[in-house]
């Protein structure tokens, strides 16, 4: 899977979209999880409604919401009041049984609020390192990782 980068401004909302084949994933609930480390597990943040037919209803966990357009095949995640600690690697998932298929890998970047004059030193961006496989550029509020970028900062 390519990793798509979504950039948001601290304090504002960021909307992440994950397109998928609506027939292939028919009847399956979806989830948004956060990758813990480069090879670690993906920790569930929020999942769609327990009844798939009600997947269009927005579900919240803290400041993160999820809603699924099951006919159009688009999963949408909203991160409200984006904070520096929200930066990192995530996945959109399709659930079947206890297993999950990755729909999209997402790197969330948090940009400094241009109206906020506090020190932006604690804002996190991916570090420079070896090339990231299958990278391609996709401009808008999102892009895929550029070659040379990695989704986790170097461990020193």
């Amino acid at each position: 899977h390519n990793t798509t980068v979504f950039q948001g401004v601290a304090g504002q909302s960021l909307q992440v979209s994950c397109p998928y084949d609506s027939m292939k994933h028919w009847g399956r609930r979806k989830a948004w999880c956060r990758q813990l480390g480069e090879k670690g597990p993906c920790q569930r943040v929020v999942s769609t409604h327990n009844l798939w037919l009600l997947s269009f209803l927005r579900r919240w966990n803290g400041s993160t919401a999820i809603t699924d357009d099951t006919l159009g095949g688009t999963l949408t995640i909203t991160l409200r009041n984006l904070q520096p600690h929200d930066a990192g690697l995530y996945q959109c998932q399709s659930l079947h049984g206890s297993e999950a298929d990755t729909l999209r890998k997402v790197l969330v970047e948090v940009l400094a609020d241009p109206l906020d004059h506090r020190d932006a030193g604690d804002l996190w961006f991916p570090g420079e390192s070896e090339s990231f496989e299958d990278a391609h550029v996709e401009h808008s509020i999102s892009r895929s990782l550029l070659e040379g970028e990695i989704p986790f900062p170097p461990t020193s």
Epitope: K24, W26, G27, H96, S98
Partner: antibody
Framework: EVQLVQSGAEVKKPGESLKISCKGS????????IAWVRQMPGKGLEWMGI????????RYSPDFQGQVTISADKSISTAYLQWSSLKASDTAMYFC????????????????WGQGTLVTVSS | DIQMTQSPSSVSASVGDRVTITCRAS??????LAWYQQKPGKAPKLLIY???SLQWGVPSRFSGSGSGTDFTLTISSLQPEDFATYFC?????????FGQGTKLEIK
């Protein structure tokens, strides 16, 4: 009416190759996963793997990975199971089955089955 | 892989009897379980999915229950056409696995 029709019985020698088929009709073939299941003589059912004809996404059981190849041609609504070099231990009945996701619980079950293809491998 | 163990491996009963077959998973599978019926020389037929949901067209004398690791298939009043082999199957994770089967014979 949903139907899965499999190719006829085969008698082969060890080392030979073989490709059996499963043709779907009465539904949108490209939109449902198709599984292959083995049943050795007098034995139980073994899940071999599954394919989504829409994009040919395949998952194999570790027990069958590298032993068989599962493929599909959505243009003719047909799934395939093939061997490059048969062994006597491949003698079995092979079933294809449509995998349907039930939205009640977001998992999938085999709601329609082919009639089976008997493969006999003997020198 | 998740192991599925059925018991008994065979059972003899008469028409009109109530029969219960059990299936145990080696780890919790929530309610992701199916039951199939297979007659000699035929393909399996889906009876129950999601542990307790009756497949369309299946007689109401068949019922399923259980969750986690222990499941049961009950036939409330055996009919002549019910004598067959029954398999459970977990739909929790890949690879999908089946129980070894329970053969239901005429007493």
């Amino acid at each position: 009416e949903v139907q899965l029709v499999q190719s006829g019985a085969e008698v082969k020698k060890p080392g030979e190759s073989l490709k059996i088929s499963c043709k779907g009709s009465g539904y949108s073939f490209r939109s449902y996963w198709i599984a292959w299941v083995r049943q050795m003589p007098g034995k139980g059912l073994e899940w071999m793997g599954i394919i989504y004809p829409g994009d040919s996404d395949v998952r194999y059981s570790p027990d069958f990975q590298g032993q068989v190849t599962i493929s599909a041609d959505k243009s003719i609504s047909t799934a395939y199971l093939q061997w490059s070099s048969l062994k006597a231990s491949d003698t079995a009945m092979y079933f294809c089955a449509r995998s349907r996701t039930f939205y009640y619980d977001s998992s999938d079950y085999f709601d329609y089955w082919g009639q089976g293809t008997l493969v006999t491998v003997s020198s | 892989d998740i192991q599925m163990t059925q018991s008994p491996s065979s059972v003899s009963a008469s028409v009109g009897d109530r029969v219960t077959i059990t299936c145990r998973a080696s780890q919790g599978i929530s309610s992701w379980l199916a039951w199939y019926q297979q007659k000699p020389g035929k393909a399996p037929k889906l009876l129950i999915y999601a542990a307790s949901s009756l497949q369309w067209g299946v007689p109401s004398r068949f019922s399923g229950s259980g969750s986690g690791t222990d499941f049961t298939l009950t036939i409330s009043s055996l009919q002549p056409e019910d004598f067959a082999t029954y398999f459970c199957q977990q739909a929790d994770s890949f690879p999908r696995t089946f129980g070894q089967g329970t053969k239901l014979e005429i007493k």
